[in-house]
Amino acid sequence: AGGPGSRPRAAGARGCRLRSQLVPVRALGLGHRSDELVRFRFCSGSCRRARSPHDLSLASLLGAGALRPPPGSRPISQPCCRPTRYEAVSFMDVNSTWRTVDRLSATACGCLG
Amino acid sequence: AGGPGSRPRAAGARGCRLRSQLVPVRALGLGHRSDELVRFRFCSGSCRRARSPHDLSLASLLGAGALRPPPGSRPISQPCCRPTRYEAVSFMDVNSTWRTVDRLSATACGCLG
């Protein structure tokens, strides 16, 4: 049997990287009333180059229609571009109260799984 | 900053689980000529219950149309249901040669990232 298969792989040119955008606090879904903007960092991009033999065969099977995945739950045939570290984000609400939300924004990404 | 965020989470009723299917060797994309069937195990299902504060806000931002992800690279707002262990798969090719492919089939799954 193989190892845990969950260590971060260096993203490099694979496309998996940290991206950043200013977003309205109200769109974060935290329930805080605020008209402020915050910087939200997230991970996106491909991890195709980090695929295992299992992933390559899984992709082949899916492409050939030889695998019947459960409805609405297609298996993923490459590691996922996901945060490996996080940071808190702070902002001011409508009552001028300073709020801090832990582990809200990503600070590093990796191809996981 | 948070930790590595890549440890397997117990899948439980979250939907992420090991699934199994008999598949033709020729559909595995390995380049082997064989008319055999093999048992291929893979992971699929949801990891929604394993979401972090980051994931919940990412899902909210995507749902509100407040985030502009790069084209063709939508960020993933939940951990991924991925193999955490693998096993070899063996079969006979058309020349009656016994072939073994390492780490081809999953033996355990987890919500990674």
Epitope: L22, E36, V38, R39, E87, S90, F91, M92 | -
Partner: antibody, heavy 122, light 107 residues
């Protein structure tokens, strides 16, 4: 739409004064720091100064070339920041940009105004 | 004050070329380094935040790297709209300071 609009730029004589305004719309900037950056024609970017938010007691800092002559203020109720420029010199001639810097572990010039031209000439 | 030195001050390149601009800080600034693009008559626009984070809406051909004192902005395949001026900027210490700029021109 999130934007900053500067106003107040003008032609002024050396030694004169001018007050620039920067109005934010589409968001509230009370939690953010407000900076001013200037750029002389054909030259690079120069940081002028900043005013921090209420949490930091509206602390101000200035670049060496304007310290003691320029004053930054803000009115959060009006979503507006100001740059009061006194004892103006010919070398203060530039496009002046107001910039919002949202709170973060690492800060950047996040939202820029379109700039307003200040010309100091006799 | 922290001095930021960009090189080259200008460069000539063709569409499709790979272009690298470097920025050196006079002291260590960790990853408190941002990159901006400025078009004529316009305000600068943030491209890369915190040394390597791509700002949303910025094409993936732009990338940033480095930490400490040495930083790099790379454009993997130059496009016609990329022929502009680029600035690095540190936010490690007040006063925040910029590099002198790099003008990318058509060869």
């Amino acid at each position: 739409e999130v934007q900053l609009v500067e106003s107040g730029g003008d032609l002024v004589q050396p030694g004169g004064s001018l007050k620039l305004s920067c109005a934010a719309s589409g968001f509230t900037f009370s939690g953010s720091a407000m900076h001013w950056v200037r750029q002389a024609s054909g030259k690079g970017l120069e940081w002028v100064g900043r005013i921090r938010n209420k949490v930091h007691r509206y602390a101000t800092e200035y670049g060496a070339s304007v310290k003691g002559r320029f004053t930054i203020s803000r009115d959060d109720s009006k979503n507006t920041a100001y740059l009061q420029m006194n004892s103006l010199k010919i070398e203060d001639t530039a496009v002046y940009y107001c910039v919002v810097v949202v709170p973060g572990s690492i800060e950047a010039f996040d939202i820029w105004g379109q700039g307003t031209m200040v010309t100091v000439s006799s | 004050d922290i001095q930021m030195t960009q090189s080259p001050s200008s460069l000539s390149a063709s569409v499709g070329d790979r272009v690298t601009i470097t920025c050196r800080a006079s002291q260590s600034i960790s990853t408190y380094l941002n990159w901006y693009q400025q078009k004529p008559g316009k305000a600068p626009n943030l491209l890369i935040y915190a040394a390597s984070t791509l700002e949303s809406g910025v094409p993936s051909r732009f990338s940033g790297s480095g930490s400490g004192t040495d930083f790099t902005l790379t454009i993997s395949s130059l496009q016609p709209e990329d022929f502009e001026i680029y600035y690095c900027q540190q936010s490690y210490n007040i006063p925040w300071t910029f590099g002198q700029g790099t003008k990318v021109e058509i060869k």
